[in-house]
């Protein structure tokens, strides 16, 4: 058993039929010695008396809020949560496996630049009685500070018969240098509690590996004189690290005909313009990627030819 | 403003072309190592990230773009003295910091070159003949060092009398290649920045 936060405890259980469970001793936080009784949750049934209560925790029915009283007055609470271990593996029932970039990916994180700021998100089908708490650090043995905000519900989607909820959190490394060469990864730890079930999820990454720039901005077309060609130009996104001559991007330019079946024409370029033959109903799209370290491409910025 | 493309123009910063070739060569070599050594811990998640230049050179600090020198997190108190000549210095106006920066890059390359050559000598003795260092990568390191053209003492190639442990050597190769790729990215960023300045 260990303390998650004040008056909240996690009991780690090997979860299999007829498992012996875990013996837990609860102590009432009071100077009183006599006349103390214990109850569980909303029940008025007295479970025991005395300053301590010994219980055998085997299943979710044994978890919950234990309260000690004296003469109708509440003295203290202890909330017991269960953390299940099945076949030596901690349960992952609360969050959905996103399977990207590999199986058992429950947390996904992205950064728009090298400032040390990043966003992580996760998915669940659970809509109520759900809380998350997020901690992060750079390295684990001698951790350096990363500050995370509160996790918030950021999107709801319908997937078949199920609703899916996306939660996200923003974190910022306390003293980040955009030009630094990372040697210790960022660690992100999410505690998830659903009713009386506790689970924890972790992710470890270097900022350089989770970079995904915003799409190029100000994508514009300028017709060229006496020609069916146009000059396409765009700019670095505002959120990208500066100076741009140090944090350079490379771009993918794509021309797509009106029919999706039509083959796309595309090139890579380091420049922020290109000349394009713009046919009716075609569209021009541009996306960006770090020029020197190949992490994710941005989403496309698009403009119609008409 | 747009950066010029890789092919060097007359008067273009001469080392940009070489640094782009370096990044390409080390990335290819790392990819090859990860494929060939697929049953060894060779991915970024599996290896320990070591920097053989730590406390010997200070490339990130010495080559910091001016715009980032206001960022306290980027400023390290580490001071290293460097030689200050070199043919990548395009004009006499070249600042002292730029000279420090380029000589720090040169020292990095020299240290990695020695490590890679020592390692290659060991890998050539491996009866499995599983992996060797790409000669193109070694040549590109050499070309960039020549373009930087700093005079410094030659570091003797390390020779070891004991029987090499090929498993450890291959893991060390992965660690070195990951670290060198990260340094090659920094070098490329620096050359691009200097070229645009």
């Amino acid at each position: 058993i260990w303390e998650l936060k004040k008056d909240v405890y996690v009991v780690e259980l090997d979860w299999y039929p007829d498992a012996p469970g875990e013996m837990v001793v609860l102590t009432c936080d009071t100077p009183e010695e006599d006349g103390i009784t214990w109850t569980l949750d909303q029940s008025s049934e007295v479970l025991g008396s005395g300053k301590t209560l010994t219980i055998q925790v085997k299943e979710f029915g044994d978890a919950g809020q234990y309260t000690c009283h004296k003469g109708g007055e509440v003295l203290s609470h202890s909330l017991l949560l269960l953390h299940k271990k099945e076949d030596g593996i901690w349960s992952t029932d609360i969050l959905k496996d996103q399977k990207e970039p590999k199986n058992k990916t429950f947390l996904r994180c992205e950064a728009k630049n090298y400032s040390g700021r990043f966003t992580c998100w996760w998915l669940t089908t659970i809509s109520t009685d759900l809380t998350f708490s997020v901690k992060s650090s750079r390295g684990s043995s001698d951790p350096q500070g990363v500050t995370c905000g509160a996790a918030t519900l950021s999107a709801e989607r319908v997937r078949g018969d199920n609703k899916e909820y996306e939660y996200s959190v923003e974190c910022q490394e306390d003293s980040a240098c955009p030009a630094a060469e990372e040697s210790l990864p960022i660690e992100v730890m999410v505690d998830a509690v659903h009713k009386l079930k506790y689970e924890n999820y972790t992710s470890s990454f270097f900022i350089r590996d989770i970079i995904k720039p915003d799409p190029p901005k100000n994508l514009q077309l300028k017709p060229l004189k006496n020609s069916r060609q146009v000059e396409v130009s765009w700019e670095y996104p505002d959120t990208w690290s500066t100076p741009h001559s140090y944090f350079s991007l490379t771009f993918c330019v794509q021309v797509q005909g009106k029919s999706k079946r039509e083959k796309k024409d595309r090139v890579f370029t380091d420049k922020t313009s290109a000349t394009v033959i713009c046919r009716k109903n075609a569209s021009i799209s541009v996306r960006a990627q770090d020029r020197y370290y190949s992490s994710s491409w941005s989403e496309w910025a698009s403009v119609p030819c008409s | 403003r747009n950066l010029p493309v890789a092919t060097p123009d007359p008067g273009m910063f001469p080392c940009l072309h070489h640094s782009q070739n370096l990044l390409r060569a080390v990335s290819n070599m790392l990819q090859k190592a990860r494929q060939t050594l697929e049953f060894y811990p060779c991915t970024s998640e599996e290896i320990d990230h070591e920097d053989i230049t730590k406390d010997k050179t200070s490339t990130v600090e010495a080559c910091l773009p001016l715009e980032l020198t206001k960022n306290e997190s980027c400023l390290n108190s580490r001071e290293t003295s460097f030689i200050t000549n070199g043919s990548c210095l395009a004009s006499r106006k070249t600042s002292f910091m730029m000279a420090l920066c380029l000589s720090s890059i040169y020292e990095d390359l020299k240290m990695y070159q020695v490590e890679f050559k020592t390692m290659n000598a060991k890998l050539l003795m491996d009866p499995k003949r599983q992996i060797f260092l790409d000669q193109n990568m070694l040549a590109v390191i050499d070309e960039l060092m020549q373009a930087l053209n700093f005079n410094s003492e030659t570091v003797p190639q390390k020779s070891s009398l004991e029987e090499p442990d090929f498993y450890k050597t291959k893991i060390k190769l992965c660690i070195l290649l990951h670290a060198f790729r990260i340094r090659a990215v920094t070098i490329d960023r620096v050359m691009s920045y200097l070229n645009a300045s």
Partner: nanobody
Framework: EVQLVESGGGSVQVGGFLRLSCVGS????????MGWFRQAPGKEREFVAA????????DYRDSVKGRFTISRDNARNTMYLQMNSLKPEDTAVYHC??????????????????WGQGTQVTVSS
Amino acid sequence: EVQLVESGGGSVQVGGFLRLSCVGSGRTLNMYNMGWFRQAPGKEREFVAAISGKGLISDYRDSVKGRFTISRDNARNTMYLQMNSLKPEDTAVYHCAAGQWSAGPFTRERSYEYWGQGTQVTVSS
């Protein structure tokens, strides 16, 4: 294996024009980016113009923009460079090149794996 052969070079006066052609054989080139690069005596080879596989996207060296036009005819496996208002500084050997679109930025020499021998262009005043 792709073979590239350039033609159309020659000597012209300042302000004159030339049309260079590059014919590919050995493989259909419509999946390849193609480009023109030039090398003047004692100088590095430099990018001139490049064009995408279907011919819809192109780019030019700043100094030739508005004077040169790159195009291609995939049915003939041929790429062209129309050079107008020629200047003495355009004097060089012009090489054509072809490379997979995914190989890298199409204005960069190293993104091209196949090269022609080159055709000489001389502009005299």
